[in-house]
């Protein structure tokens, strides 16, 4: 990536890291308003299976692993990217490495959920306070989950699907920060590990993933009022280990693995028409990216 200053634009979809033949250090940003991609400062260490989020206008890359010809190292790292300076800086590491992690943000705090370290599948969860640059463990999930989808709705943290080391999961659970406890919610209709999970219009969406046999293109959403999961239109491509984010009322899914190919495809879901459309291609195919959108 280039080390010059990034243009000061409004809302971009950032994609960090990923995997194609080895873990990647790319940071690229897509501007949906004009369809262009920006090549930005590389991660200091390549990583895949990471998660991305934005707090206070800064992009954070959390966990993952560096799978390279030199070896394979799960990551406990938290790194912060400043779009104004186009620079990465390290923050305090998590208590344990977490590959195929899920993250969510509540009240400016980053929650790191599940993930794996070697063959250990975590149920542990920890919270990062940017002002103090500190991590603290919170209540563990009821289930060990890697490849877990995480989303925040109404200041509640949802952990959806994943893999517990033995089974891919359709179960989901919800964390209540005030009580510091997890409770199971209605299970999805479909087993999904490595799905893309996000929130749009008071619903939690779970897109794609892997059911233990095949990659999926199906998509379902959870209505917190009715506590039910309902299928919506499927994506055009089957994909697991995909990136997902929401931009201006639409869901974007980026890359992933379809069981044969590392996808460069980016699809966009319009909830008004219940349709998916191909909107762009990433500069190269990859899975296991961390994705987030900058704030206004």
């Amino acid at each position: 990536g280039s080390m010059g200053h990034a243009p000061k634009v409004g809302r971009l979809i950032y994609t960090a890291g990923g995997y194609f033949r080895q873990s990647l250090s790319y940071l690229e940003a897509y501007n949906p308003s004009d369809g262009t991609w920006l090549d930005l400062a590389d991660l200091q260490v390549p990583r895949s299976g990471l998660a991305g989020c934005v707090v206070g206008g800064l992009l954070y890359a959390v966990g993952g692993r560096n799978n390279s010809p030199d070896g394979n190292t799960d990551s406990s790292a938290l790194d912060c990217y400043n779009p104004m300076t186009n620079q990465w800086s390290p923050c305090a590491p998590m208590s344990v490495p977490r590959n195929r992690i899920g993250v969510g943000v509540i009240d400016g705090h980053i929650y790191a959920v599940g993930g794996s370290h070697g063959c250990i599948h975590h149920n542990s969860v920890e919270r990062y306070e940017p002002e103090r640059d500190e991590w603290h463990l919170v209540a563990p999930m009821l289930t060990r989950r890697i490849g877990v989808g995480v989303a925040v709705l109404n200041r509640l943290l949802y952990a959806v699907g994943g893999f517990d080391g033995t089974n891919r999961l359709n179960s989901a659970e919800c964390y209540y920060p005030e009580r510091n406890e997890w409770r199971m919610i209605t299970a999805m209709n479909t087993i999904r590990s490595g799905a893309g999970v996000c929130v749009l219009h008071n619903c939690i969406y779970a897109a794609g993933g892997y059911d233990g046999q095949d990659q999926l293109n199906s998509v379902e959403r959870y209505d917190v009022e009715t506590e039910t999961w309902t299928f919506v239109a499927p994506m055009k491509h089957r994909r697991s280990a995909l990136g997902i984010t929401v931009h201006q009322g639409r869901i974007y899914v980026l890359g992933g693995y379809d069981g044969h190919t590392f996808l460069d495809s980016v699809e966009c879901y319009d909830p008004d028409t219940d349709t998916w459309s191909e909107v762009t291609r990433m500069t190269s195919g990859r899975s296991g990216v961390g994705v987030a959108v900058t704030m206004e």
């Epitope: 995997y19 299976g49 070896g71 394979n72 033995t166 490595g194 892997y210 069981g259």
Partner: antibody
Framework: EVQLVESGGGLVQPGGSLRLSCAAS????????IHWVRQAPGKGLEWVAS????????LYAKSVAGRFTISADTSKNTAYLQMNSLRAEDTAVYYC?????????????AGQGTLVTVSS | DIQMTQSPSSLSASVGDRVTITCRAS??????VAWYQQKPGKAPKLLIY???SLYSGVPSRFSGSRSGTDFTLTISSLQPEDFATYYC?????????FGQGTKVEIK
Amino acid sequence: EVQLVESGGGLVQPGGSLRLSCAASGFAISASSIHWVRQAPGKGLEWVASIDPETGETLYAKSVAGRFTISADTSKNTAYLQMNSLRAEDTAVYYCARCRAASAYAADAAGQGTLVTVSS
Amino acid sequence: DIQMTQSPSSLSASVGDRVTITCRASQSVSSAVAWYQQKPGKAPKLLIYSASSLYSGVPSRFSGSRSGTDFTLTISSLQPEDFATYYCQQSYSFPSTFGQGTKVEIK
């Protein structure tokens, strides 16, 4: 019946290439992690490479990293090991194996192997 | 890399004997250890996974146990078909590594 059948072995000169195939039947390779393990003549077992069915990520032993490539074609239910820049020390019987979560990623099924001989 | 030190490298035993083979990991591998049996010219066959779980179809005379970083394969009453080479394997961390093997021969 679960079966794995390796093919593609043979005699090759140092610096040469071979592509091994592992045809699976009785199960879908899309549902398992596929590994290659080798055994030099009269020696023990050495793990070589693996591919994850969910993420597509591959792992390699340091001894082969950068020279070997594991891949899978789920439509043919076949895994492959592309071996480039072969060395005398790569001479071995190569086994493909199925590893599943149900058996804690131990190799619960393997083929009969294919012999690769690297010699001038 | 984690080393799996297997002992003995060979042993002689008679049918009906109780046989014990040990693997010591150079660092913690939790219970992520498997045991295999291999006969000449054949592929390895899984006997035990997760240190002590008997794989489907494997006779109950085979058992596995763990004590810290020490792992043991026991054959309670050796049968003629058990004369073979046995390997342990750790899959706790990358790269997966095998013990050097133990050849069980007829006394």
